[in-house]
């Protein structure tokens, strides 16, 4: 019953050069095609991909290999549907310094932002 | 199982025009994402640029931006790869390559490649 | 335009340990991803995201990466691992994809 573009707002505070990964969950749409964005600009991310989960439920990707200060800010996913271009909530990135321990906050309601990833 | 079928090899005058393709089975073609790479012979890899299945959104590299277009079909699950005018050093072999990312169970996604065997494209008077 | 720098070649004798290197100013911010081309054949994915080995490479394979420098180990290299060996990651913009000039590995 149409586009169904997940997300809750959430803050996220990450060390400086750790990695994040971000995702975002569009159902209702059998081939979006998932754009993020920082602070109103198209995140350009050639090597992420997304995943089907189904055929009408898509995840998609933002991995940041080392968080920097450029890269704090407010990301968002968005997918084009029928001409118009849907958002999701904002996830707040925010830094504390290399070294101090990080954590982050989430509100408790249903989202498909996921928690940083620190993989690297 | 994941196969990826170029056409076949080509030779052609400088000058000429050419599409060269890339046919996809063995899964939902607008799922993945398919690059094109050139490789002269006896040289590296180059990458020329990148079709997303969804709303098929084109990338190109530098070198080959305004050279080359990549286009799809998705009703044959087909990429191309197409020249208005070629050039000598157009000569090359040219992969397609299938982009994946799949959860086995988990949240982190794992990352898998297809490559097509290749096809040979060879430019000369 | 962006570029990712290897040595043109590496030698090793079997058993040794191999290291290729693969040097450009993103890669602080972006990950490496390296491949394997054995002559005549398209190209293997052995390393994707600096260190996350593809299913089915040996566990000999193990990628790593600091500052602007990724590098492709080879422990105890075998005869079979002889082959080019390529780095490939994304433009300091993040709008195009690139690849190292490739490394000759040989093992004798």
């Known amino acids: 019953a149409g586009l169904k573009l997940m997300g809750a707002p959430v803050k996220l505070t990450v060390s400086q050069g750790q990695p994040v990964k971000l995702n975002c969950s569009v159902e209702g749409m059998e081939e979006p095609d998932i754009q993020w964005v920082k602070d109103g600009a198209v995140v350009q991310n050639l090597d992420q991909l997304y995943i089907p989960v189904s055929e009408q439920h898509w995840i998609g990707f933002l991995s940041l290999k080392s968080v920097e200060r450029s890269d704090a800010g407010r990301y968002w996913c968005q997918v084009e549907d029928g001409g118009e271009t849907e958002i999701s909530q904002p996830v707040w990135l925010t830094l504390v310094p290399r070294g101090s321990s990080a954590h982050h906050h989430h509100h408790h309601h249903h989202s498909a932002w996921s928690h940083p990833q620190f993989e690297k | 199982e994941v196969q990826l079928v170029q056409s076949g090899a080509d030779v052609k005058k400088p000058g000429a025009s050419l599409t060269i393709s890339c046919q996809a089975s063995?899964?939902?073609?607008?799922?993945?994402?398919i690059s094109w790479v050139r490789q002269k012979p006896g040289k590296g890899l180059e990458w020329m640029g990148q079709?997303?299945?969804?709303?098929?959104?084109?990338h190109y590299g530098p070198s080959f931006q305004g050279h080359v277009t990549i286009s799809a079909d998705r009703s044959t699950a087909t990429a191309y790869l197409q020249w208005r005018s070629l050039e000598a050093s157009d000569t090359a072999m040219y992969y397609c390559?299938?982009?994946?990312?799949?959860?086995?169970?988990?949240?982190?996604?794992?990352?898998?490649?297809?490559w097509g065997p290749g096809t040979l494209v060879t430019v000369s008077s | 335009s962006y570029e990712l720098t290897q040595p043109p070649s590496v030698s090793v004798s079997p058993g040794q340990t191999a290291r290729i290197t693969c040097s450009g100013d993103?890669?602080?911010?972006?990950?490496a991803y390296w491949y394997q081309q054995k002559s005549g054949q398209a190209p293997v994915l052995v390393i994707y995201?600096?260190?996350k080995r593809i299913s089915g490479i040996p566990e000999r394979f193990s990628g790593s990466s600091s500052g602007t420098m990724a590098t492709l180990t080879i422990s105890g290299a075998q005869v079979e691992d002889e082959a080019d060996y390529y780095c490939?990651?994304?433009?300091?913009?993040?709008?195009?994809?690139?690849f190292g000039g490739g490394t000759k590995l040989t093992v004798l």
């Open positions: 490939y990651s994304t433009s300091t913009g993040g709008n195009y994809m690139v």
């Open positions: 063995g899964y939902t073609f607008t799922d993945y994402w």
């Open positions: 995201e600096d260190k």
């Open positions: 993103a890669l602080p911010k972006k990950y």
């Open positions: 079709i997303r299945g969804p709303a098929s959104a084109t």
């Open positions: 390559v299938r982009h994946q990312q799949q959860t086995s169970g988990g949240t982190i996604p794992e990352y898998y490649q297809h």
